[in-house]
Each structure stands twice: as structure tokens, then as C-alpha cells.
């Protein structure tokens, strides 16, 4: 997280820290007491594109709450993970839910609307480009999708598109994604924050929902927008996968 | 009831028989285990128009179920009883509800629609113009209101109205009333049936509702329509009165 | 008049212990029921538990007891709707 | 971890008899509850009564017990929503 605030109170008990092969920090989001969402890209970090979920599983280390190590039983990649940058992690044991460790809900309603603010917590790189040692969070507005597409791809018209990412890496942008950021204080997500939730507070229900999962965490206040996978598009697959496994 | 059928099974456990001063039989309808609805006209039978509820109370005898005598504590007349022909009777003790003695529900929904069939039970006069000694009932369709008004008042236009009741007595007809009858078999309500419910079966809820209370029971298959007070217009007053008393 | 059987006698301590569930516990209660042709009218759900003062209380109604109110419009033998 | 107090010990027969109500009776039950941060997932309402075979049964779920599932999206210390 570039800028933002320290999570002193444990306000993001769904936030997990995942250490990938070769020690890179990434994010994951607890969505039940035995399952987490993260990005497919996170899972493939330092693996070849042909790696299987079985190959990936033993290379990951996962922490929830206050540095509580949890063991991973399996990884399930989204069947269309090159388009929907998502994977699921199943733990060997259910975690005990406490005030420090609690899943976030997956939404049935579509909370995404330009200007709406969400909270993104993360263990990713800070303004010094170091991985943070204390959980941070930032408050980011949902962006206008067309502006985001133009920012990264020059145009919304397919034949006029070309790759214009200010950070040299292109996000996956499609109907399953939305964009958020930047704040006027130049606060943003950064490397290692991917897999974290775009958390929205439904005030009617007094419940926090993961409206999205951060996929493109390379903006780092250089590019204007982080890109998130829409959680509403995941719910059916998530529920089926959890039920099957 | 003129024509109709005998209630052999006890299908109208809300039906009460009220004997007024000088032994006239009338109807009343159990709407809770301590309260009944009847018409104001029934209560005033053989009393002067200036009689008070306190004067009327001791002159009434009331039976529920299979001739079970119940004692009356008080009578409450509708505040506008010359327009809304209704009164409430409170019993000294709650009756024990059994398969023979059970209140009918008052509706929140408006069940009245032309052509809809309701059931009216009663202890009133039969085709021989004698009071029946066994409870009878008849199935009657809700009538078109304008036809009913024309039948009794010659016109629906106020300035063209004149009193044309085929039975020489005029019903109270207004926005608080509806009409029902006659069947093709010349079945009808008659003297003494007033105070009985126009009972409609809500098949969705499998519950019987008093959609109306028979006010004008003088049709006797000579005039075409009985006239009923709409129960939806009574509910608030009934609930307030029961709560206050 | 059928008044229902109490599932557990207050003088009977031979009651089998209910099974435990993960992350849960059991609470012992009484539920008020109504005889035939009556239904429960309660501020809460008609279920009462013993508080520390050994009084039966409902979470919503407190010590206030429910009432059994007469059912309406449910004749045991509805009319045969024929002509 | 707070697991709740059992309101009535199974070995304790000093339980005060609940008050009677007109036209009603009482039924004795156990209700499954969940510890903090969990909620009951049950086919029925989580309330079980003893049947004639002295088994704890729920009207909907039968002998199948409920589960305590993790609550989601209810942090004890939500973020201060200010900037």
C-alpha cells in the first residue's frame, strides 16, 4: 500500500499474507473458515504457466490474523483464469474465527458504482518499495471504467486499442473487472497487495463485502488505477467449488 | 335463510344466535373468544332510538355453538351506527374455543368483488317464514353495486333517487356496504339472519374471513339483494374498541 | 382436551445429555405451546430460559408470559362448497 | 472462549416449574447456540426436544444436528470510515 494507514485495530480480519515460492509476499482473502480467494497470478508467481494446482500447493506459505501459520490442503484455479484472474485456496483445517481472523462476505448485490469508496488492505510494497511489516489499508474510489480502459489501452474501441500502461505491464481488463483509485493524496495499492479484497461496507446490513479482489497491483501511484476482479461474477463458481471440494 | 342447506357438521362455528327483547331471533358473529359483531338494528330491536347501550345489554340473550348460553358484559354501538349498522358485544367470560365455537377472522384484504361467492349462515326465517331450529347456510354471489342501488333506490344519481324497495323497507346503502344475492335457485337471507357473517374462504391461507356483516335481512327472495356492512371498514374501530374495553 | 406431553419431567434427572457441536453449546429452555384451536401470542418466540435468579425469562418479553389466543377462521369441518 | 452457561444442569432437579398459561402447556427443549463470531446453520431452528425414544430431535432436521458456521463481514473493530 502506498500511503494509506496502519491497521492498528484489526479491522481487516479477512486479510491473509501469502508467501509464494522464492519469498514474495502477496495477498489472499478469507471467505470462509476454510477457504481463501487470491489471484491466479499470485499462485503462479515463480512457476511456469504449465504448472498445475498440485505443483503450486506445496510452494505456498499462508498466514492469517496476527501471523498465524495455516496449512494449505489444495489450490483450485478458476477454469478461465487467464480472463478471470482468480484462484481458491482450501486449508487443511478450519481456522477458529476470532476478532483477529474472520472471513469477509461475498456479495449477491453489485456494490460497484463509480465514486463509491472501498477499503483495500494489504501486505504489499509501500512508498519505499519495501514489503510492509504491519498491515496497511487505503480508501479508494471506484473509477469510471472507460477512463480506466483508455488509461491502459488508449481506447475503448477494440480496433483502436494499443498497450499504453504507464507501468509497462498490462492489466487484464474485461467485463469481469473494475478499476479503483487513485486518491488525491496519491495513495494506491502496489506489488504484493494483489489477492486482497476491495471491501465495501453495506450499512443497511452492517456487513462488509468483498466487492472485488485486487488483480493488477502494479499501479503503485504511477499508473492511475488498480484493477479488481468483480466478486459478483465469482460467487456461483466459488460456492460450487467449495461444495465440491 | 330461504332455501340453502342445513349446517350438519358445524361449519360455521362463529355463528351466534341472539334473542332480543320480546323473543325475536337475530344473528351475531364471534370475532374473538370474548367479542361478537352484530348490527346496531339488531341491538335496538324493540327498543326506542334513544335507548343506550347500557339499557340494551340486559335485554339480550346470546347462544354460541350447540345452544351454549353466554353472558353479556356490555354492548358498544358504532359511533356512526345510523350509517354503519354495527355494534359490538363483549362477553363476561372468554368462551372456550372448540370445533363448535370458533371466531371468524376480520380481513385486512378486500375480498369483495362482483361474482365472488360467500357463505351466509343464519338462524333467521325460512321459506315458511318461521325461525329455523337448525342452523342453515346459503352460498351467495357478491352483486354489482350499481344494480343493487338501482334496485332499492331507482338510480345511482343522487337527485334521481327514490325509495323503490320491493319489500317496502329501505336498506342502508353507502360506501360502507356491499350487496349479495340472489341465487338462481331463489335462495336468500331473511328476517333474523342480520348480524351473520358473509364468510369468504381465502384458499391461499386456508382461512375464513368475515368479509361483511349482514345488515339488511328483509330481502327474503322477494327483493334481489341482501346488504352487508364491509368488514374492512370496521377493523380499526373493532380493534380499538376491543383494546379500550 | 389434549394438552400435550412434557418432553422432560422436572423431577426427572435421567435426561440424556444432548450431543455437542463444534463452536457451539446448548441452552436449556421451555417453550410455551397452546391447546388445539389456540395459537401463541407472545412478545418473543414463546421460549423461556432460566436466568441467574432462577426466573424463566424470554429474551424479548422478559418475565412477561405469552398468551394463548383463539384461532380464527379455521373450522374443523368446513362447509362442502357445493350447490 | 465464552461458551455460554447451561441454564439447567441435567443432574439438577431443583429447577423451578415454569408458570402455567391459560389454554396452554410447556414443552422442554434444548437450543443449540454458537460461540461468538459463529452463527447457527440448521435445517430447523436449532431447537431440539426429547422424543419418546429419549433422542433429541428437531421437527425439521430430525436427529441431524445443526452446525456453527463462521460469521463473515462483521469485524469487531471496523475501520474508522474517515479520510
Amino acid at each position: 500500500i502506498i500511503g494509506g494507514s496502519m491497521d492498528a485495530k484489526g479491522s481487516f480480519p479477512w486479510q491473509a499474507k501469502m508467501i509464494s515460492r522464492h519469498g514474495l509476499t502477496t495477498g489472499a482473502t478469507l471467505i470462509s473458515d476454510q477457504w481463501l480467494l487470491t489471484t491466479a497470478k499470485n499462485l503462479f508467481l515463480n512457476h511456469s504457466e504449465t504448472a498445475s494446482a498440485k505443483d503450486i500447493t506445496p510452494t505456498l506459505t499462508l498466514y492469517v490474523g496476527k501471523n498465524q501459520l495455516v496449512e494449505i490442503e489444495k489450490v483450485v484455479l478458476h477454469p478461465n483464469h487467464s480472463v478471470v484472474d482468480i484462484g481458491l485456496i482450501k486449508l487443511k483445517q478450519r481456522v477458529l474465527v476470532t476478532e483477529r481472523v474472520m472471513p469477509i462476505c461475498l456479495p449477491s448485490k453489485d456494490y460497484i458504482a463509480p465514486g463509491r469508496v472501498g477499503y483495500v488492505s494489504g501486505w504489499g510494497r509501500n512508498a519505499n518499495f519495501r514489503f510492509t511489516d504491519r498491515l496497511k489499508y487505503v480508501m479508494l474510489p471506484v473509477a469510471d471504467q472507460d477512463k480506466c480502459v483508455v488509461h491502459y489501452e488508449n481506447s475503448t474501441v477494440p480496433e483502436k486499442k494499443n498497450l499504453t500502461s504507464p507501468v509497462g505491464v498490462q492489466p487484464i481488463l474485461n467485463e469481469h473487472t473494475f478499476c479503483a483509485g487513485l486518491t488525491k493524496y496519491q495513495e494506491d495499492t502496489c506489488y504484493g497487495d494483489a489477492g486482497s479484497a476491495f471491501a465495501i461496507h453495506d450499512m443497511e446490513e452492517d456487513t462488509w463485502y468483498a466487492a472485488g479482489i485486487l488483480s493488477f497491483d502494479k499501479s503503485c501511484a504511477v499508473a492511475e488505477y488498480g484493477v479488481y476482479v468483480r466478486a459478483t461474477d465469482l460467487k456461483d463458481w466459488v460456492q460450487e467449488t467449495m461444495a465440491k471440494n | 335463510i330461504i332455501g340453502g342447506s342445513m349446517d350438519a357438521k358445524g361449519s360455521f362455528p362463529w355463528q351466534a344466535k341472539m334473542i332480543s327483547r320480546h323473543g325475536l331471533t337475530t344473528g351475531a358473529t364471534l370475532i374473538s373468544d370474548q367479542w361478537l359483531l352484530t348490527t346496531a338494528k339488531n341491538l335496538f330491536l324493540n327498543h326506542s332510538e334513544t335507548a343506550s347501550a347500557k339499557d340494551i345489554t340486559p335485554t339480550l340473550t346470546l347462544y354460541v355453538g350447540k345452544n351454549q348460553l353466554v353472558e353479556i358484559e356490555k354492548v358498544v354501538l358504532h359511533p356512526n351506527h345510523s350509517v354503519v349498522d354495527i355494534g359490538l358485544i363483549k362477553l363476561k367470560q372468554r368462551v372456550l374455543v372448540t370445533e363448535r365455537v370458533m371466531p371468524i377472522c376480520l380481513p385486512s384484504k378486500d375480498y369483495i368483488a362482483p361474482g365472488r361467492v360467500g357463505y351466509v349462515s343464519g338462524w333467521g326465517r325460512n321459506a315458511n317464514f318461521r325461525f329455523t331450529d337448525r342452523l342453515k347456510y346459503v352460498m351467495l354471489p357478491v352483486a354489482d353495486q350499481d344494480k343493487c342501488v338501482v334496485h332499492y333506490e331507482n338510480s345511482t344519481v343522487p337527485e334521481k333517487k327514490n325509495l323503490t324497495s320491493p319489500v317496502g323497507v329501505q336498506p342502508i346503502l353507502n360506501e360502507h356496504t356491499f350487496c349479495a344475492g340472489l341465487t338462481k335457485y331463489q335462495e336468500d337471507t331473511c328476517y333474523g339472519d342480520a348480524g351473520s357473517a358473509f364468510a369468504i374462504h381465502d384458499m391461499e391461507e386456508d382461512t375464513w374471513y368475515a368479509a361483511g356483516i349482514l345488515s339488511f335481512d328483509k330481502s327474503c327472495a322477494v327483493a334481489e339483494y341482501g346488504v352487508y356492512v364491509r368488514a374492512t371498514d370496521l377493523k380499526d374501530w373493532v380493534q380499538e374498541t376491543m383494546a379500550k374495553n | 382436551v389434549e394438552l400435550g406431553n412434557d418432553a422432560m419431567d422436572f423431577e426427572d434427572d435421567s435426561c440424556p445429555k444432548p450431543p455437542e457441536i463444534a463452536n457451539g453449546y446448548v441452552e436449556h429452555l421451555v417453550r410455551y405451546r397452546c391447546r388445539q384451536f389456540y395459537r401463541l401470542r407472545a412478545e418473543g418466540d414463546g421460549v423461556y430460559t432460566l436466568n441467574d435468579e432462577k426466573q424463566w425469562v424470554n429474551t424479548v418479553a422478559g418475565e412477561k408470559l405469552p398468551e394463548c389466543e383463539a384461532v380464527c377462521g379455521k373450522p374443523k369441518h368446513p362447509v362442502d362448497q357445493v350447490q | 472462549v465464552e461458551l455460554g452457561n447451561d441454564a439447567m444442569d441435567f443432574e439438577d432437579d431443583s429447577c423451578p416449574k415454569p408458570p402455567e398459561i391459560a389454554n396452554g402447556y410447556v414443552e422442554h427443549l434444548v437450543r443449540y447456540r454458537c460461540r461468538q463470531f459463529y452463527r447457527l446453520r440448521a435445517e430447523g431452528d436449532g431447537v431440539y426436544t426429547l422424543n419418546d425414544e429419549k433422542q433429541w430431535v428437531n421437527t425439521v432436521a430430525g436427529e441431524k444436528l445443526p452446525e456453527c458456521e463462521a460469521v463473515c463481514g462483521k469485524p469487531k473493530h471496523p475501520v474508522d470510515q474517515v479520510q
Epitope: - | 368483488a113 384458499m203 391461499e204 | 357445493v82 350447490q83 | -
Partner: antibody, heavy 121, light 107 residues
Framework: EVQLLESGGGLVQPGGSLKLSCVAS????????MSWVRQAPGKGLEWVST????????FYADSVRGRFTISRDNSNNMLFLQIDSLRAEDTAVYYC??????????????WGQGALVTVSS | DIQMTQSPSSLSASVGDRVAITCRAS??????LAWYQQKPGKVPKLLIY???ILQSGVPSRFSGSGSGTDFTLTISSLQPEDVATYYC?????????FGGGTKVEIK
Amino acid sequence: EVQLLESGGGLVQPGGSLKLSCVASEFTFSNYAMSWVRQAPGKGLEWVSTFSSGGSRTFYADSVRGRFTISRDNSNNMLFLQIDSLRAEDTAVYYCAKAQFVGHWAQYNYWGQGALVTVSS
Amino acid sequence: DIQMTQSPSSLSASVGDRVAITCRASQGIRNYLAWYQQKPGKVPKLLIYDAFILQSGVPSRFSGSGSGTDFTLTISSLQPEDVATYYCQKSDSPPLTFGGGTKVEIK
């Protein structure tokens, strides 16, 4: 005049899904039970599903249970039928129908014009 | 579930004839039965409900009778405009099954 207007019909492949809508006007929609009835080409009427007025009770014919889902939106006077796992035998005109009286399940006094659903590969 | 069986499945009669269509329920449904008329290419039209009550606007040559399990729709004097398929439907509680239909034609 009471009106019922269906939409959402069309050609679908076996195994596919479709959502039919019925918009109602000129009556107090929430007070009436509403149903879907279908008619296969050249065949008779078949009751499909009913949604109660009060609460949220839903009923289905055995032939569609588990595949069809009826729902209603009283605030917008709309009735829906979500049709999943479509089969060739689901090909029919689907009618939206209103119970005649408050508290009644059936005896439909108003019908929509029908929406044709064709299941074919 | 209660089955509704209509007979005959089709009939042909002359103008002015008295025509009767029967509908049998596999279990008693009291008088909770409706009759519909459907002309080719048109939506069904309610004729009779509660077994014998004529829907407003329906000609009086149509009548219904019966209760329990056996019901009859009668057209006292068949008219050319009565050419249609007629259906019964149980209306007591779901499932709200229809009969198979009776096609009425003019000789």
C-alpha cells in the same frame, strides 16, 4: 383494464436457460396469486407454477420442479419464471395468469398474450 | 397428485344441439373447478368457476354442474362461435392441474 404482458421468450438450445417476465397493470398485483401456464404446440394447457400473494410460497408441476424458479417483484408488478436445463419438451407458449379473486389460487380471469419458448439445437 | 380426466377428447355436434363435456378428478375437490374456452390462436377464457358459477359476460347457454369428483360443462344449444377447445382445471390448491381438453366442432 387489467393487462398482463410477457416477454423473454425465444430460441434456446437444450440445457440452456431463459428468464420470462410478466408485467401486470391495473390491479393490486401484490394481493393476487399469480401463475405460469404453458401450452406446447397443438397440445393442451399445462399448469407450470404458482406464486402465492402473501408470504413467498411457490409451487411447481412435477415436470418442471428443480429446473424452473418462479419469483415476483410486487413493487414493480412483475412476475418471473427462470427456466434452466431446458429440454425439447419445454417448447411451448408460456402464459402468465392472474387468479380471479383475492385469496384464490386459480380460476384465471386474465391471461397474458403468451411468450413462445423454443428449445432446439 | 390429483389427476383431471376430461371426456370426450373431441366431439362433433350440430348447431342447436345440447353438448356435455365431463371432467373427473381422481380425488374429491369439492366445487373447486373452473372451465375455460380456448379458440384457435387465442388465449383461454374463463367460462365457469366454483363448478357452476357463470363468469360475467358468458352466454347463459353455458352451465356447469357437479361436485367432489365428477363435473359437467353443458352447452344447451351449440352455436357456431362455440367451436373451441374446452379445459377444466382444479382450483382448490396447487398443483392446479388442467384436464386434457375437449375439442368441440360443428358437424
